[in-house]
């Protein structure tokens, strides 16, 4: 397994609708045709696998139908969007990129993007 550099923003604030987007950029050492992107979340001692997508260079990322993630790719950049976030989902979201094909296998892990999620205040009842 060979190492590869992955860059991602340090901090992102989710929108009031619970949507957060960030770019994950990897320094591809070769001409990979099959790339796998995984989003991991770390909060204290818990590390969970949030979502993953494999794509062929030049094609769209495909996440599972029930995934909370969507994304697009452009060259060595992946634009990731995570939706349905609530305050309890605040944490460090790590971008992991694997060049699956052709060999050799490369692995790159970003330093993580701290996503802050603030639940919107409920609208006060208004009398008309």
């Amino acid at each position: 397994c060979k190492a590869m550099h992955v860059a991602q923003p340090a901090v992102v604030l989710a929108s009031s609708r619970g949507i957060a987007s960030f770019v994950c950029e990897y320094a591809s050492p070769g001409k990979a045709t099959e790339v796998r992107v995984t989003v991991l979340r770390q909060a204290d001692s818990q590390v969970t696998e949030v979502c993953a997508a494999t794509y062929m260079m030049g094609n769209e990322l495909t996440f599972l139908d029930d995934s909370i993630c969507t994304g697009t790719s452009s060259g060595n950049q992946v634009n990731l969007t995570i939706q349905g976030l609530r305050a309890m989902d605040t944490g460090l979201y790590i971008c992991k990129v694997e060049l699956m094909y052709p060999p050799p296998y490369y692995l790159g892990i970003g330093n993580g993007t701290q996503i802050y999620v603030i639940d919107p205040e409920p609208c006060p009842d208004s009398d008309f």
Partner: antibody
Framework: EVQLVQSGAEVKKPGASVKVSCKAS????????MDWVRQAPGASLDWIGN????????SYNQKFKGKATLTVDKSTSTAYMELSSLRAGDIAVYYC?????????????WGQGTLVTVSS | QIVLTQTPLSLSVSPGEPASISCSAS?????MHWFQQKPGQSPKSWIY???ILASGVPDRFSGSGSGTDFTLKISRVEADDAGVYYC?????????FGTGTKLELK
């Protein structure tokens, strides 16, 4: 070379407590979570919980809350799991385990296991 | 919690024949991870992130699947493959392992 060396087998009486140790070497102890897994005789593997040695924050499987307590001693690079109020159902081999890389190759390293026997 | 059910519970295979172990999750998981355990030994990481072979694992092994259904396959079983195989998920806590599949050689 990463090594996780656990304390030896224990025989305890019902109601007693036991503290199992896991001495880590070959890496920076505070860089990786330490997880604990139980295997009862002839049974599958059961995740007990884990501890972040840096922050000492813990996460437990609800099933083991109140039964297991995870701690670390950073000065000796040792993780501990204490089991309280032992009963026959706690007879098992207990393993400590660590990931291969940060965020990759989960549970790549395992201790040799510690057999805990409960007998009156 | 996510329950992982493995099938079959045990299988007996002749050397050189293929073998397949399934792991079904009670809800969708991102990846499945596999461990091999031999009697009296600690489990060993065997396949992680669904399809990546751990260091030293022969390429007769492969892993595949997505969502709730995952498979570990051996193209040609050898004597050293005997043992119990467990699947594991890391999509949500508590982390859970499968029920285990014992592979024996005929």
């Amino acid at each position: 070379e990463v090594q996780l060396v656990q304390s030896g087998a224990e025989v305890k009486k019902p109601g007693a407590s036991v503290k199992v140790s896991c001495k880590a070497s070959g890496y920076t102890f505070t860089d990786y979570n330490m997880d604990w897994v139980r295997q009862a005789p002839g049974a599958s593997l059961d995740w007990i919980g884990n501890i972040n040695p840096n922050s000492e924050s813990t996460s437990y499987n609800q099933k083991f809350k109140g039964k297991a307590t995870l701690t670390v001693d950073k000065s000796t690079s040792t993780a501990y799991m204490e089991l309280s109020s032992l009963r026959a159902g706690d007879i098992a081999v207990y393993y400590c385990t660590r990931d291969g890389n940060r965020y990759d190759a989960w549970f790549a390293y395992w201790g040799q296991g510690t057999l805990v026997t409960v007998s009156s | 919690q996510i329950v992982l059910t493995q099938t079959p519970l045990s299988l007996s295979v002749s050397p050189g024949e293929p073998a397949s172990i399934s792991c079904s999750a009670s809800s969708s998981v991102t990846y499945m991870h596999w461990f091999q355990q031999k009697p009296g030994q600690s489990p060993k990481s065997w396949i992680y992130s669904t399809s990546i072979l751990a260091s030293g694992v022969p390429d007769r092994f492969s892993g595949s699947g997505s969502g709730t259904d995952f498979t570990l396959k051996i193209s040609r079983v050898e004597a050293d493959d005997a043992g119990v195989y467990y699947c594991q998920q890391r999509t949500s806590y508590p982390l859970t392992f499968g029920t285990g599949t014992k592979l024996e050689l005929k």
